[in-house]
Interface confidence: medium
């Protein structure tokens, strides 16, 4: 009569959710470090970069005590993807100096990734919304030269540690309210 | 390569202000919020306040709330600090940090307050 | 009187293993980061460890932090001469929300 009922499905503790989420979150947050710190021993920054493309900055001192977690996941998730789509297109696009970033580029685009998959296996398993499917995102012009793709390297790995680091802190503090 | 640099640091009577502004340069200065701290004579780290990487939210510690105000002009990559009604315990070095998170990763090298009759 | 509690001093010798506490509550230690800095002799702190075990670029892998409920512990492995600082351990406190930080623990080397 084929094989026999599987044990019932415990409801996820979603502080040990939100605990594995911060664990992937605080690794990839160490990769971007020292990737970050790979490029700029390669490659010295001289000054701040920007990119326009980047998402805006979504957490700071003052936000932390409004925090609500379908908003955080949503908003982390969206910025992570557009980081994550920025590194793909350095891959493709960064140039030759770039390509001494390899493997670590690799290995941080998919660990990226991942993370972006646990988010949104947590928002399903704490029966959050889902946010609508993203739009088409305008593809990203080509650096104009070889330190034009640097430059953006620094300012999209100077913007995924920033990112990271103020979600580790928002996740962390949103696991204490939970 | 991140730089922040103190200023505006002396001697000052009790009762009286000063201001100390933290020229910072290597960074986006508008995407960190940013931190005082200071440190009396032989004593430990205690923290003063953080302005917001936009202005827009302010937290200080209690012993300076009403006394103190912290600033920022995002356009000249400069973070100040308005210090009114001075004291003797007042009497530190005076430190500018950036937090990208949770931590003050990087610091200026301090300017010295005394303040004294 | 500090938020966090740190010891006033340790000391250990050259190539020996040493350990710093710092003990709080769950205001803050047992619900935020932990991060620690190092002061050396006349200059401005120095990020050392960040949300509990994390080492900013350049810091040698010889320091270490760790974390258990309301308590962290920073551990200096291969001590040398100069790992000889001030060494303070800081957290976000919930219930004063500000940042607090222990009183600092002088570190000589024998």
């Known amino acids: 009569p084929g094989p026999p009922p599987g044990p019932p499905r415990v409801s996820p503790d979603p502080r040990a959710e939100l605990d594995s989420t911060v664990l992937l979150t605080r690794s990839l947050l160490a990769d971007t470090r020292q990737l970050a710190a790979q490029l700029r021993d390669k490659f010295p920054a001289d000054g701040d970069h920007n990119l326009d493309s980047l998402p805006t900055l979504a957490m700071s001192a003052g936000a932390l005590g409004a925090l609500q977690l379908p908003g955080v996941l949503t908003r982390l998730r969206a910025d992570l993807l557009s980081y994550l789509r920025h590194v793909q297109w350095l891959r493709r696009a960064g140039g030759s100096s770039l390509k001494t970033l390899e493997p670590e580029l690799g290995t941080l685009q998919a660990r990226l990734d991942r993370l972006l998959r646990r988010l949104q296996l947590l928002m399903s398993r704490l029966a959050l919304p889902q946010p609508p499917p993203d739009p088409p995102a305008p593809p990203l012009a080509p650096p104009s030269s070889a330190w034009g793709g640097i430059r953006a390297a620094h300012a999209i790995l100077g913007g995924l540690h920033l990112t990271l680091d103020w979600a580790v802190r928002g996740l962390l503090l949103l696991k204490t309210r939970l | 390569e991140v730089q922040l640099l103190e200023s505006g640091g002396g001697l000052v009577q009790p009762g009286g202000s000063l201001r100390l502004s933290c020229a910072a340069s290597g960074f986006t200065f508008s995407h960190y919020d940013m931190n005082w701290l200071r440190q009396a004579p032989g004593k430990g780290l205690e923290w003063v306040g953080v302005i917001s990487y936009d202005s827009s939210n302010k937290f200080y510690a209690d012993f300076v709330k009403g006394r103190f105000t912290i600033s920022r002009d995002n356009s000249k990559n400069t973070l100040y600090l308005q210090m009114n009604s001075l004291r003797a315990e007042d009497t530190a070095v005076y430190y500018c940090?950036?937090?990208?998170?949770?931590?003050?990763?990087?610091w200026g090298q301090g300017t010295l307050v005394t303040v004294s009759s | 009187q500090s938020v966090l509690t740190q010891p006033p001093s340790a000391s250990g010798t050259p190539g020996q293993r040493v350990t710093i506490s710092c003990s709080g509550s769950?205001?803050?230690?047992?619900?935020?980061?932990v991060n620690w800095y190092q002061q050396l002799p006349g200059t401005a702190p120095k990020l050392l460890i960040y949300?509990?075990?994390l080492l900013p670029s350049g810091v040698p892998d010889r320091f270490s932090g760790s974390k258990s409920g309301t308590s962290a512990s920073l551990a200096i492995s291969g001590l040398r001469s100069e790992d000889e600082a001030d060494y303070y351990c800081s957290a976000w406190d919930d219930s004063l929300n500000a940042v607090v930080f222990g009183g600092g623990t002088k570190l000589t080397v024998l």
């Open positions: 769950s205001s803050n230690i047992g619900n935020n980061a």
């Open positions: 949300y509990d075990d």
């Open positions: 940090a950036r937090t990208p998170g949770s931590h003050f990763d990087y």
